[in-house]
């Protein structure tokens, strides 16, 4: 039995920040679980982890230098990524693992979300006119 995951097909990070919501076909509230967000077609980079246990506070961390936070809903985890760079535009996959009680469960691979990071638009400096020619 696999958990199904739904993600937005595409998100644009205008201010170098984005909320990515992972919606699951599963209630996480009475489970010990590990929700994670992975970058790249091969999911090679683990961007952020949300570890939950019904009796304790959420633990949110990144071991890959991303600035992230996480929020738990009944059947969802929302990852809030900040300080993204333009070159971090990529496809991001939600993953969920239910660790306890047994049996261990995880998800069918989702279609992923393309996060398009747009750099901050800096106002162009006015052109200083050169010295006027007589």
């Amino acid at each position: 039995n696999k958990i199904l995951v739904k993600q937005s097909p595409m998100l644009v990070a205008y201010d170098n920040a984005v909320n990515l919501s992972c919606k699951y076909s599963y209630n996480l509230f009475s489970r010990e679980f590990r929700a994670s967000l992975h970058k790249g077609l091969d999911s090679a980079v683990e961007v952020c982890v949300v570890y939950g246990n019904y009796s304790q506070q959420l633990q949110v961390y990144s071991k890959t230098g991303f600035n992230c936070d996480g929020k738990l809903g009944n059947e969802s985890v929302t990852f809030y990524l900040q300080n993204l760079y333009v070159n971090q535009t990529d496809i991001y996959f939600c993953k969920i693992e239910v660790m306890y009680p047994p049996p261990y469960l995880d998800n069918e691979k989702s279609n992923g979300t393309i996060i398009h990071v747009k750099g901050k638009h800096l106002c162009p400096s006015p052109l200083f006119p050169g010295p006027s020619k007589p």
């Epitope: 076909s25 996480l28 009475s30 009944n74 009680p101 047994p102």
Partner: antibody
Amino acid sequence: EVKLQQSGAELVKPGASVRLSCKASGYTFTEYIIHWIKLRSGQGLEWIGWFYPGSNDIQYNAKFKGKATLTADKSSSTVYMELTGLTSEDSAVYFCARRDDFSGYDALPYWGQGTMVTVSS
Amino acid sequence: DIQMTQSPASLSVSVGETVTITCRTNENIYSNLAWYQQKQGKSPQLLIYAATHLVEGVPSRFSGSGSGTQYSLKITSLQSEDFGNYYCQHFWGTPCTFGGGTKLEIK
């Protein structure tokens, strides 16, 4: 068809031990938790604990620690509960039940027929 | 541990009437609650899971409601086969305590 077949009634002496069995069929034995429940005459249901045959994971109600021991034999798809140091308080019907996971919500949809244990000298 | 307070302990009603049994917990169990019916000499039968979801094959006169710490089982238009004992059970961690039970008798 999921079936939990429990062993027959037991008449035991105070201080003795008894081992009850719950044989599972109709599903993959190692994929589901089995719960044990006690029902004393004129009283309500009391949760004893659960056993997961896939990893031999166990959870006990603190009240039954030292009283009940849960084990399993994968080859025969059977979960056992041993009760030790029996007293009249242990006279009851004991049920095993399979826990199903309804998308993150648990319940016990399948129950054995129960085993009556009578403690008497 | 979570305490389950089920009420009433017993009630005597006539066929065709409506009854409501309640289960209160001492902390939020986030709808991780099941309801069972048990008849004399038989094994309990699951009626409702996740507080409100009716098990397939259970008549629609049974319904579950509630959230947080307060849950109810309602039986409308009682039939003779509905008489027996009813229990709630939580699955918010262990021990997975049962309520004290409600004995439903024919008036």
